[in-house]
């Protein structure tokens, strides 16, 4: 997150981290039920660990943290390259969470976000637009949903209904490492960090997010059948 601020501890209890090896964070994720996470399809890796209830970027133990393995990764069947449509993936964890003030699921928005809606994006991704500067703790950033027209003008021929744009204030954006993390609007999960230009946080190059309102049925059906 570029030019965000430290999240309040436990203010994003649905925020998850996907880890490679012992503790190399490579993507964000979102807890949507006691045993299921959502993340971006482009975050798919064969082996990873899941960390919930953690505030710090470092692997230091925190009392609220819970660690899990992913036992099933189910990317949306329509995820495609190079267009990046349908950029979402369900992860089933090896057990259910212990519900606590640090770890709670978030409800997915059934209605699509409208232009001007204020939302919050969070993550442990790089805090510099073009270099690797990682934060000490989870970062939060208020962003505004942009019109479909403005989104398509920013990225001609690259936006479809499975995406929405948000942000666009120069110097403020999600960035590398935030992928798969939550965009929460009015207390409901509206999107996932999907993609954007490099360097991050350029004028008229907003962040692009997976438009989860388009996938409520697929998410429910997939969880029920697995």
């Amino acid at each position: 997150i570029v030019n965000g601020s430290d999240c309040q501890k436990d203010a994003q209890p649905w925020q998850g981290a996907l880890l490679l090896g012992p503790n190399k964070l490579y993507c964000g994720a979102v807890l949507i039920s006691p045993q299921w996470l959502l993340t971006a399809a482009h975050c798919r890796k064969p082996v990873f660990r899941i960390r919930l209830g953690h505030h710090s970027m470092s692997p230091v133990y925190e009392s609220g943290q819970q660690m899990f393995q992913g036992i099933k990764s189910i990317p949306h069947p329509g995820y495609s390259h190079p267009g990046h449509s349908n950029d979402l993936m369900l992860i089933k964890m090896n057990r259910k969470i212990r519900d606590s003030h640090s770890v709670k699921p978030v409800e997915i928005a059934c209605d699509c976000a409208t232009e001007g809606t204020r939302c919050m994006v969070s993550g442990w991704g790089t805090t510099s637009s073009s270099h690797n500067n990682f934060p000490k703790v989870l970062q939060c950033l208020n962003i505004t949903v942009l019109s479909e027209e403005r989104c398509k003008n920013s990225y001609p021929g690259q936006i479809d209904k499975t995406m929405f744009c948000a942000g666009d204030e120069e110097g403020r954006d999600s960035c590398q490492g935030d992928s798969g993390g939550p965009v929460v609007c009015n207390g409901k999960l509206q999107g996932l960090v999907s993609w954007g230009d490099f360097p991050c946080a350029q004028r008229n190059r907003p962040g692009v997010y997976t438009n989860l309102c388009e996938f409520v049925k697929w998410i429910k059906d997939t969880m029920n059948s697995n």
Epitope: A40, N132, Q158, Q176, S179, V193, S194, W195
Partner: antibody, heavy 127, light 108 residues
Framework: QLQLQESGPGLVKPSETLSLTCTVS??????????WVWIRQPPGKGLEWIGS???????YYNPSLKSRVTISVDTSKNQFSLKLSSVTAADTAVYYC???????????????????WGQGTTVTVSS | DIQMTQSPSSLSASVGDRVTITCRAS??????LNWYQQKPGKAPKLLIY???SLQSGVPSRFSGSGSGTDFTLTISSLQPEDFATYYC??????????FGGGTKVEIK
């Protein structure tokens, strides 16, 4: 300012293994943001991608060379290496190492342009 | 594999001329197309990335356009130092990363 420098033997015998190293100076090879790439150019011909490695150690190889290629990173020495086994005269080329800079973040991070190159090293395969 | 076809393979032009080189992909690559310049005995140099973005330090007489399958590199007013070979390159999620065959720009 980032600089890349290839090193290794200029002459390799047929059927042997070609080994090259690229030393990165002026920046960290363990950066999350970049790919590290090997490309070659046979005499008088165009550019051919050999393979790449990313921050997590994931490798991507040209399918036409995959069975013979290994790319690895040594973060402690800020180097990445190429090994090409069972070489023939057709592997004679100028070998370049380069940095792949992503064209975006997130799903776009897998697409990149080579923005910094080594000067190249000539490898001849001959007995 | 995605094939990249460059045309022409060579061209002769004079200083001050407007030069256009085209590159066609065998399937859509969105805007993931880069252009390089290579002079004899030297490593390639990145000119344009993401189809139309000018690499830092590259003169503004170079420009790129296109998306999907058809792309163009334009040199608005050819300078003596621009005589070189130009390559397009598609940047893949799935390997292989491929280059066009090159366009040699020679002095008329």
């Amino acid at each position: 300012q980032l600089q890349l420098q290839e090193s290794g033997p200029g002459l390799v015998k047929p059927s042997e293994t070609l080994s090259l190293t690229c030393t990165v100076s002026g920046g960290s090879i363990s950066s999350l943001d970049y790919y590290w790439v090997w490309i070659r150019q046979p005499p008088g011909k165009g550019l051919e991608w050999i393979g790449s490695i990313d921050y997590s150690g994931d490798t991507y190889y040209n399918p036409s060379l995959k069975s013979r290629v290994t790319i690895s990173v040594d973060t402690s020495k800020n180097q990445f290496s190429l090994k090409l086994s069972s070489v023939t005269a057709a592997d004679t080329a100028v070998y370049y190492c380069a940095r792949g800079r992503p064209l975006g973040y997130g799903a776009r991070h897998y697409y990149y342009a080579m923005d910094v190159w080594g000067q190249g090293t000539t490898v001849t395969v001959s007995s | 594999d995605i094939q990249m076809t460059q045309s022409p393979s060579s061209l002769s032009a004079s200083v001050g001329d407007r030069v256009t080189i085209t590159c066609r992909a065998s399937q859509s690559i969105s805007s993931y197309l880069n252009w390089y310049q290579q002079k004899p005995g030297k490593a390639p140099k990145l000119l344009i990335y993401s189809a139309s973005s000018l690499q830092s330090g590259v003169p503004s007489r170079f420009s790129g356009s296109g998306s999907g399958t058809d792309f163009t590199l334009t040199i608005s007013s050819l300078q003596p130092e621009d005589f070189a070979t130009y390559y397009c390159q598609q940047s893949p999620y799935f390997p292989p990363l491929t280059f066009g065959g090159g366009t040699k720009v020679e002095i008329k």
